[in-house]
Interface confidence: medium
Amino acid sequence: SPVPPSTALKELIEELVNITQNQKAPLCNGSMVWSINLTAGVYCAALESLINVSGCSAIEKTQRMLNGFCPHKVSAGQFSSLRVRDTKIEVAQFVKDLLVHLKKLFREGQFN
């Protein structure tokens, strides 16, 4: 049966928590990703940014989970208008910012 949206969001949050807490060396070798506008379409925008990071096992589960939240197919090199123009940040900072934002969505009861 389908996972309830609240459970799926909790699981995504848990995964991001694990990433931030288990970080020893620089996450994804310090790879940089496009910063995104967190105010709308956050799941697809986050996936569009993170999907361009390859060979980083630490975020593979996050990529798969985000894919489950995003209603359309996302492929590498694809960018929506939600990207913050010409601003790149380290994956570690991206994950931390995304985690706080998703917790705020959870706090609002916004599970979709």
Epitope: I13, F106, R107
Partner: antibody, heavy 122, light 108 residues
Amino acid sequence: QMQLVESGGGVVQPGRSLRLSCAASGFAFRTYGMHWVRQAPGKGLEWVAVIWDDGSNTHYADSVKGRFTITRDNSKNTLNLQMNSLRAEDTAVYYCVRAPQWYLSAEAFDLWGQGTMVTVSS
Amino acid sequence: SYVLTQPPSVSVAPGETATITCGGNMIGAYLVHWYQQKPGQAPLLVIYDDVDRPARIPERFSGSNSGNTATLTISRVEAGDEADYYCQVWDHNSDHMVFGGGTKLTVL
């Protein structure tokens, strides 16, 4: 400097009413959610009520719902708490607290008043 | 309503590390804030959004949050850290702000 100053506390008999006020200064009052938090003597912190920045939404702790009313006047930078049908268990220091708002939930309490004491006793 | 559980007291020697826990069902999905309250004073925010420190709060104060437990850690504890500490979350189910019962930190 940013400041919250409570007033209106005192001794009141059970069943009577009291109105607390909080004067805000040094920040854009109308852009913040405002809360009341209380602390009974020797006890922990208890959240009482919140009112959103524009006054459109209020929420109350179960222990005060139907008896307390939180209001604000953004033109005067004031927060109020009307307390009716007071009980002995309402005896506490009442703090006026500022919290940034994120849509319809509250962020951390980043500015507190010094508190005003309310004693409910016959 | 959501329930946050803290140990009533924690004791630590000066210079050591104090760990104060805050338990709640899947608290790792919530943003947790921590407050310090000294006798006769209003509470002071020391950690917000699980891990962030307001300006003027020493780096000795840090937070973490995962699973069913959030933690406030105070390293190199000083006598001035002796106070009551409270955790807090916003519960979206009840639209209530919820405090833990508080932990009294004693510096031996």
